[in-house]
Interface confidence: low
């Protein structure tokens, strides 16, 4: 359905509001330096020449493409090459080279302040003296740290961002309220953030095949009843949303999951009787609650996947005749029997069988050749099972901040060249693995596990792709998404790497480490840790934890002190002589 | 939206013939192999015939080859299913579904073979 605006079509599909809020993140996630009034008044503009084609179609620019309209905004940017460099040679291209130029240009881990979160009345009073145009500074503030933000679900947030402020700045203890509240829109905004990463990456590092096929396991796990065509139906417009916003055309996107949110929720008889709830929400509540929703019973008369895949004399031409679609049937079929099994464990039981297919088939006896070919599978599924076992018997055993330890040193060891930050970053997120899936049934771990490692490791792929500096690393991102974290498991201590000259200066403390966080203090001792193993990579458990005792003690003593910046200076020392002599450097 | 519609169900005595049809839309019918499969009172689902996407592979359990003829005609997006001498033991619900799963999202239609 060709439109001869595709501006104004948007713009009706929308609203004002949400149009001006996705032109807003779209533009912030590409020019994530300019300052916020900057992109407000480019999108007031926009706004304003949208409004112009509703009104007339065929007014002059509007039968212009979203891309050229956008492009040419963003390169009116006065300071485009002071602020961005290269990144303004993007805008001597035609589209849709222009574009994706820019989208090359998305920098995940930018050069920007940590947001600080002002006094609660602070914030009440700039919510109440401006509702507008404080919730346009946090679409705004998120968009430019999480260029890959899935921007339909960025709405949502900014709803309960303003239904947290409305409810609780009326409160009588505003602070009691609200801070919990935006302590889990924040936390829960990173999950999203790294989970849609995830998505973008499967897309454009391994193309469009690789994404439909995680689509195609992960919907056949959550909607077992509904038959593999609808599910084929489901995964081809799913993967064009995705597709959208993983390319910058953020009002295309959010208009087609609004279409197919409709359109499951009308079909639902067919997809899940899972849905009735999240399909009585409102749009943006619907939307969100579909793609968390839990899977649906598996129907009770499945019979064995044998008959079709192995036993039939028929898999071979089957396979011929339309390769993708009797392995897209094969993954349905496995995934819908198998919800505790990882979306990524599927997908290797997938690549393992087409991969048997692509060998027997052009056998002498093909059956004969893929008659054992599930029994390939066991050590396929055992592997994660006796990991996530091992693990979780770890996690119980030390709890998360020790077990955040155990993996900063365990991957430290394991690629030492990748930074202190990104080290403390990963290692601590792959360590909430533990509080977020052990306490699950064994039936719900492995999904739970390896499937939100998937989506931290990516955090390391995509950190590590902006500064390489790892081999091992640049291998176990690009031979296979689905390996990524089995690839990673397997890597060894480096035995390479050339320790890291030591630096006093590294393990020099201040008072100003008394006054931070719980949560803050840890991240300054596992930054001391990590940085402890690229000095020592060979240091054992036992010497490394003797040291962090010590080091938690020296903080706890100082903390304590009347005189704590003389305290931190003459027993830092002390600390620092006997680390060294503890670790034999 | 997917939807499969069986017809041709019926009351037939033993020995006679029925050609059953099912009418498929909301996807690319000529794309999909299609089985029939059938639920006889208070039994699981039996896989009874399937046929690939061009129609020249057809497949039947053990119990009614010879009997049973599955065609389709993608220009017209159904499927057939030719019966004939029919058995009490065919009496049941007849679904026809996309692959061969024995899952079932259609309301089926009934045959039932009685003296």
């Known amino acids: 359905d060709a439109h001869k605006s595709e501006v104004a079509h948007r713009f009706k599909d929308l609203g004002e509001e949400n149009f001006k809020a996705l032109v807003l993140i779209a533009f912030a996630q590409y020019l994530q330096q300019c300052p916020f009034e900057d992109h407000v008044k480019l999108v007031n503009e926009v706004t304003e020449f949208a409004k112009t084609c509703v009104a007339d179609e065929s007014a002059e620019n509007c039968d212009k493409s979203l891309h050229t309209l956008f492009g040419d905004k963003l390169c009116t940017v006065a300071t485009l090459r002071e602020t961005y460099g290269e990144m303004a040679d993007c805008c001597a291209k035609q589209e849709p080279e222009r574009n994706e130029c820019f989208l090359q240009h998305k920098d995940d881990n930018p050069n920007l302040p940590r947001l600080v979160r002002p006094e609660v009345d602070v914030m009440c009073t700039a919510f109440h003296d401006n509702e507008e145009t404080f919730l346009k500074k946090y679409l705004y503030e998120i968009a430019r740290r999480h260029p890959y933000f899935y921007a339909p679900e960025l709405l949502f947030f900014a709803k309960r961002y303003k239904a947290a402020f409305t409810e609780c700045c009326q409160a009588a203890d505003k602070a009691a309220c609200l801070l919990p509240k935006l302590d889990e829109l924040r936390d829960e905004g990173k999950a999203s953030s790294a989970k849609q990463r995830l998505k973008c990456a499967s897309l454009q590092k391994f193309g469009e095949r690789a994404f439909k096929a995680w689509a195609v396991a992960r919907l056949s796990q959550r909607f077992p009843k509904a038959e593999f065509a609808e599910v084929s139906k489901l995964v081809t417009d799913l993967t064009k949303v995705h597709t959208e916003c993983c390319h910058g055309d953020l009002l295309e996107c959010a208009d087609d999951r609004a279409d197919l949110a409709k359109y499951i929720c009308e079909n639902q008889d067919s997809i899940s009787s899972k849905l009735k709830e999240c399909c009585e929400k409102p749009l943006l509540e619907k939307s969100h609650c579909i793609a968390e929703v839990e899977n649906d019973e598996m129907p009770a008369d499945l019979p064995s996947l044998a008959a079709d895949f192995v036993e039939s004399k028929d898999v071979c031409k089957n396979y011929a005749e339309a390769k993708d679609v009797f392995l897209g049937m094969f993954l349905y079929e496995y995934a819908r029997r198998h919800p505790d099994y990882s979306v990524v464990l599927l997908l290797r039981l997938a690549k393992t069988y087409e991969t048997t297919l692509e060998k027997c088939c052009a056998a002498a006896d093909p059956h004969e050749c893929y008659a054992k070919v599930f029994d390939e599978f066991k050590p396929l599924v055992e592997e994660p099972q006796n990991l996530i076992k091992q693990n979780c018997e770890l996690f119980e055993q030390l709890g998360e901040y020790k077990f955040q330890n155990a993996l900063l040193v365990r991957y430290t060891k394991k690629v030492p060249q990748v930074s202190t930050p990104t080290l403390v970053e990963v290692s601590r997120n792959l360590g909430k693995v533990g509080s977020k899936c052990c306490k699950h049934p064994e039936a719900k771990r492995m999904p739970c596990a390896e499937d939100y490692l998937s989506v931290v490791l990516n955090q390391l792929c995509v950190l590590h792709e902006k500064t390489p500096v790892s081999d091992r690393v640049t291998k176990c991102c690009t031979e296979s998404l689905v390996n990524r974290r089995p690839c990673f498991s397997a890597l060894e201590v480096d035995e390479t790497y050339v320790p890291k000259e030591f630096n006093a200066e590294t393990f020099t403390f201040h008072a100003d480490i008394c006054t931070l966080s719980e949560k803050e203090r840890q991240i300054k001792k596992q930054t001391a840790l990590v940085e402890l193993v690229k000095h020592k990579p060979k240091a054992t458990k036992e010497q490394l934890k003797a040291v962090m005792d010590d080091f938690a003690a020296f903080v706890e003593k100082c903390c304590k002190a009347d005189d704590k910046e003389t305290c931190f200076a003459e027993e830092g020392k002390k600390l620092v002589a006997a680390s060294q002599a503890a670790l034999g450097l | 939206e997917v939807q499969l519609l069986e017809s041709g169900g019926g009351l037939v005595q033993p020995g006679g013939s029925l050609r059953l049809s099912c009418a498929a839309s909301?996807?690319?019918?000529?794309?999909?192999?299609m089985s029939w499969v059938r639920q006889a009172p208070g039994k699981g689902p039996e896989w009874v015939s399937a046929?690939?996407?061009?129609?020249?592979?057809?497949r039947y359990a053990e119990s009614v080859k010879g009997r049973f003829t599955i065609s389709r005609d993608n220009s017209k997006n159904t499927l057939y299913l030719q019966m004939n001498s029919l058995r009490p033991e065919d009496t049941a619900v007849y679904y026809c579904?996309?692959?061969?799963?024995?899952?079932?999202s259609s309301q089926g239609t009934l045959v039932t073979v009685s003296s």
């Open positions: 046929i690939d996407s061009g129609g020249a592979d057809t």
């Open positions: 909301g996807f690319t019918f000529g794309s999909f192999g």
């Open positions: 579904t996309i692959g061969r799963s024995a899952s079932r």
